[in-house]
Interface confidence: low
């Protein structure tokens, strides 16, 4: 098979030798009967470059051909070549170079006595010769010609057609349709590549992604896909992935955590506007944000507690002496005194020391403005020292501490995390700097919490963030941390980087994985 870009085709159609004579006017010998002259005719064809004056001599630069005997004297030639398998009509001259658009053609009709002797050198055998030169453009149409020399006529036609996959004026443009990794196209009339639907680019190797797929952050391996580059997500790969653990934040670029209004911290998890978001202060108290998710409440008179949730009972413990009854007023109280007593808290008595009013060894002294007062010994109280003091009754110990009455004093046994005489000092659990890797410590009650920097987690920020934390492995796969990445150990029947692909069922037998196919398939 000669490689070529096109072919010159010559179709011999009809030859007429009216008298059966040679070119030298001699009779063709060898007739078996009348007519006496019978020219057994074959042809020599020579195709060469354009010559202003055509020379029949070699070389036939574009090719030459010698036909078998095609007929006697006058005959027509069918397309295809007829009975003789050694001859095909049209005669084809393949070209391995660009068709120049011009040619010279020599056709000699020759006579032979024997079908086996097709020598063309003997001039005595020549019946007629045509020598012509022509311009010819590439095309399917045949150019028809008739050569007459008086005694003979030769009717023939010719054309130059491109080989399959060759196009253009000189058949110099090569285009073979394909639909594989190297291109997805058919060929246009001039040999230009016409991309199949879904493909683009000079060689139609670039798939056209899902319409709307972000050109920068998405890509595709086949038409209509939209696969996201690292850090992007969504159907069109136009949503950035926030920093892992980002709570009340957004991103413009991957791994950002830009806090929404009112939020702060690395993960935007610290409420900077706790007062507005949560309204923690009760009973008309004033709330003040103190940052990092904390606040303070300024209580209105008559209220107490961290959120001013407790109404203060000014009658507790009872301020009224000598059996006076107490009435709670807003931010105040009033005492109703029993007979014989008076004063704001019924502290004044109509009695005097002469009446011996002081009990339990209390020392009595008369007051200049009337009445008396008792100075009680240790362990007793009351206007008349009538009450044995229960030092724990006033609940002097804070934060759940246990109060121990020592007779003339008390002792507070603090719960874990508190200290001080009344257990009202919160022990600073951050003092030992428990947060590793630059974490920020926040003190609690017998506790602390750490706000970790990016890349760390755990109670003490000592654990690097697990790349498996966000469950990247699908279909029951096991995720393993692998230093600079994670690796999914797929369940049987699944494959792909994240075990997201259902593998085709294999016939039973040993599990041999085709390494090349499998890996290239994942690319």
């Amino acid at each position: 098979q000669v490689w070529s870009s096109g072919v010159f085709e010559l179709k011999l159609q009809e030859f007429v030798n009216k008298k059966g004579l040679l070119g030298n006017r001699n009779c063709c010998r060898g007739g078996a009967g009348p007519p006496p002259c019978a020219c057994r005719t074959f042809f020599r064809v020579c195709l060469k470059h354009y010559q202003a004056s055509v020379s029949p001599e070699p070389p036939c630069t574009y090719g030459s051909a010698v036909t078998p005997v095609l007929g006697v004297d006058s005959f027509s030639l069918p397309d295809g070549g007829g009975a003789d398998s050694a001859f095909s009509n049209p005669i084809r001259f393949p070209f391995g170079f660009t068709w120049p658009g011009t040619f010279s053609l020599i056709i000699e009709a020759l006579h032979t006595d024997s079908p086996d002797d097709l020598a063309t050198e003997n001039p005595e055998r020549l019946i007629s010769r045509l020598a012509t030169q022509r311009h010819l453009t590439v095309g399917e149409e045949w150019s028809q010609d008739l050569h007459s020399s008086g005694r003979t006529d030769l009717k023939y036609s010719y054309r130059f057609v491109c080989d399959e996959h060759y196009y253009g004026e000189g058949c110099s443009v090569f285009c073979r349709p394909r639909d594989d990794a190297f291109g997805h196209f058919t060929c246009g009339e001039r040999g230009e590549k016409v991309c199949n639907p879904g493909w683009k680019g000079p060689y139609c190797t670039e798939p056209i992604c899902l319409p709307g797929c972000d050109e920068q952050h998405g890509f595709c391996d086949k038409p209509g896909e939209c696969k996201c580059r690292v850090g992007w997500q969504g159907r069109y790969c136009d949503e950035c992935i926030r920093y892992p653990g980002c709570l009340h934040g957004t991103c413009q670029q991957p791994w950002q955590c830009n806090c929404q209004e009112g939020w702060g911290g690395l993960f935007c998890n610290q409420d900077l506007n706790y007062c507005t978001h949560h309204k923690p202060c009760k009973n008309g108290a004033t709330c003040t944000n103190t940052g990092q998710g904390s606040y303070t409440c300024s209580c209105r008179p008559g209220y107490t507690g961290a959120t001013c949730e407790l109404g203060i009972d000014e009658c507790d413990p009872s301020p009224c002496k000598n059996g006076g009854s107490c009435t709670d007023l807003e931010n105040s109280y009033s005492c109703t005194c029993p007979p014989g007593f008076y004063g704001k808290i019924c502290e004044l008595s109509a009695m005097t020391c002469a009446d011996g009013p002081c009990f339990n060894g209390g020392r009595c002294s008369d007051s200049p403005d009337g009445g008396y007062s008792c100075r009680c010994p240790v362990g007793y109280s009351g206007f008349n020292c009538e009450k044995k003091i229960d030092y724990c009754s006033s609940s002097p110990c804070s934060n759940g501490a246990k109060c121990v009455d020592l007779g003339d004093a008390y002792l507070c046994r603090c719960q874990a995390g508190f200290s001080g005489r009344h257990c009202d000092d919160n022990v600073d659990d951050c003092a030992s700097s428990p947060c590793a890797n630059g974490g920020t410590c926040r003190d609690g009650v017998n506790d602390f919490s750490c706000t970790c920097p990016p890349g760390y987690t755990g109670r003490n920020c000592s654990a690097p963030v697990s790349r498996c934390e966000h469950a990247p492995c699908h279909n029951g796969a096991t995720c393993h941390e692998r230093g600079h990445r994670y690796v999914c150990e797929c369940a049987r029947g699944y494959g792909g980087p994240n075990c997201q692909f259902l593998l085709p069922e294999l016939p039973p037998g040993p599990a041999v994985v085709d390494l090349t196919e499998k890996l290239e398939g994942q690319g």
Epitope: V230, G483, H484, R485, L515
Partner: antibody, heavy 120, light 110 residues
Amino acid sequence: QVQLVQSGAEVKKPGSSVKVSCKASGGTFSSYAISWVRQAPGQGLEWMGGIIPQFGIANYAQKFQGRVTITADESTSTAYMELSSLRSEDTAVYYCAREGYSDYSAFDYWGQGTLVTVSS
Amino acid sequence: DIALTQPASVSGSPGQSITISCTGTSSDVGTYNYVNWYQQHPGKAPKVMIYRVSNRPSGVSNRFSGSKSGNTASLTISGLQAEDEADYYCSSWDEHSYVFGGGTKLTVLG
């Protein structure tokens, strides 16, 4: 067919640095990890570190931490390994190797190796 | 430096079977199924023969097989052939990095 082609042999003086390249062709470069493995004359294999070009994050063996830098250029499908503060015991053949992902996890394609000789 | 322990050498006659062991710890061979075996002929780059304990890449003879028990992995070559003569290295992942065995030289006698 995947191919990893490494740069040529190098002769270096102690204390200097060497940078070896590894160009990949015939596969998807970014999706796979590229590791560097060395082999001293007559000795066994030693993993130095690796990188997934897609993430640009490198991981190094503790022994080489601070002395080796592994980088990758996605646009040219090339990985690089730079080893600094060279000493005579760094004389070895340095291989780059592609690691099949997830369900494969082995070095399935290797470069031809680059001999680095450290000598004064 | 060598984290996994392999015998320095093993030998066998053609047609015989041999087994090369690779002993690690609970933090590499014992934990992960990332045990790989590589064959290396002199002057050549290594070639993976078994990956993930017991899987054989396409193109590798079924005479090669792998297994694991506890902290020890094994490579078995049955029906030994002359071309099997080479160095064999086991490798595993140990949470942060790849570790290799010291290598085993396989000699095919005769």
